[in-house]
């Protein structure tokens, strides 16, 4: 039975021209965490393998940095990166937890975080 | 160059242990991971699994965790695979390979290791 | 485990095609895919990452296009050096696994 929940930024704001960062977090579980895919509708970001390290998609390589810890920065943020990502865990035993976060790129100055909210 | 010199061939009796190196030269040994795969004969690749020499952290296909272990010697840029309880489906060629810079795909390999099991 | 279905097996060409080859992904793998060249004897070759990128040093008619499930591996002009088996690997989620190589002779 899969117990745990991923609680993630939730829907965030930044500047066009700014770096924000994508954070999730499993919780709930003891269920062991063997990688952890970051995903844009249907492009794949990178990938964080717990013992492997990271992949980074060419098309994302230089405006994606790795880290903090699970989390993806994005950088050189532009309007088009307005949108859905997604943070997918894979674990074992339980199998796979999806967060999500809803990213808005602001062309002005009134770009703020929304709250952190929790997806079960 | 990058280079990934691997040791010589093995004949080894069901239910002992194969220990293959995989000597890396030509990069700084701890900035890539470095997997192993096999190929049996006539038979697709098949990953066992891999190690980050940075920290020592392994993954392991489960289908071999329990008889495969992988290490490294990161002042001798050396990995190694040992596969023990061999039996005859083991027999194949054994390559190490190593992931490429922050992405997974397998950008050089060892020439190979020939591990043949038989009674 | 996610199953990679290679097709054809074995194909046979004659220098100058344009040939084809498919692979499947038992589930959706995004574009971390990559592409390989095996010669007999030989160690497999690196020739197409993330799906559609060439690798450093591989010809130009190489090719790699797809995303999700279904991938395809083009070689625009076929050379006699290309006669090999080439094979699909994704490394989308562990365990990464291979498809079954499509074998490449020249007619």
């Known amino acids: 039975m899969m117990t745990g929940t991923i609680e993630t930024t939730g829907n965030i704001s930044a500047e066009k021209g700014g770096s924000i960062i994508l954070q999730c977090h499993l919780s709930s579980t003891t269920a062991q965490v063997t990688q952890v895919n970051w995903e844009q509708q249907d492009q794949l970001l990178a990938i964080c393998n717990a013992d492997l390290g990271w992949h980074i998609s060419p098309s994302f390589k230089d405006r994606v940095a790795p880290g903090p810890g699970l989390g993806l920065t994005l950088q050189s943020l532009t309007v088009n990166d307005t949108g859905e990502y997604f943070c997918i865990y894979h674990t074992y035993p339980d199998g796979t937890y999806t967060g999500r976060i809803f990213l808005e790129v602001l062309e002005s100055s009134v770009a703020e975080h929304g709250a952190r909210f929790q997806i079960p | 160059q990058v280079q990934l010199v691997q040791s010589g061939a093995e004949v080894k009796k069901p239910g002992a242990s194969v220990k293959v190196s995989c000597k890396a030269s030509?990069?700084?040994?701890?900035?890539?991971?470095m997997h192993w795969v096999r190929q049996a004969p006539g038979q697709r690749l098949e990953w066992i699994g891999g190690i980050n020499p940075n920290n020592g952290g392994t993954s392991y296909n489960q289908q071999f965790k329990g008889r495969a272990t992988l290490t490294v010697d990161t002042s001798a840029s050396t990995a190694y695979m040992e596969l023990s309880s061999l039996r005859s489906e083991d027999t194949a060629v054994y390559y190490c390979t190593r992931s490429s810079y922050y992405r997974y795909d397998l950008d050089y390999w060892g020439q190979g290791t020939t591990v043949t099991v038989s009674s | 485990d996610i199953q990679m279905t290679q097709s054809p097996s074995s194909l046979s060409a004659s220098v100058g095609d344009r040939v084809t080859i498919t692979c499947k992904a038992s589930?959706?793998?995004?574009?971390?895919l990559a592409w390989y060249q095996q010669k007999p004897g030989k160690a497999p070759k690196l020739l197409i990452y993330?799906?559609?990128y060439r690798y450093t040093g591989v010809p130009s008619r190489f090719s790699g296009s797809g995303s999700g499930t279904d991938f395809t591996f083009t070689i625009s002009s076929l050379q006699p050096e290309d006669i090999a088996t080439y094979y699909c690997?994704?490394?989308?989620?562990?365990?990464?696994?291979f498809g079954g190589g499509t074998k490449l002779e020249i007619k």
């Open positions: 589930q959706d793998v995004k574009t971390a």
């Open positions: 993330s799906a559609s």
């Open positions: 030509g990069y700084t040994f701890t900035e890539n991971a």
């Open positions: 690997h994704q490394h989308y989620t562990t365990p990464w696994t």
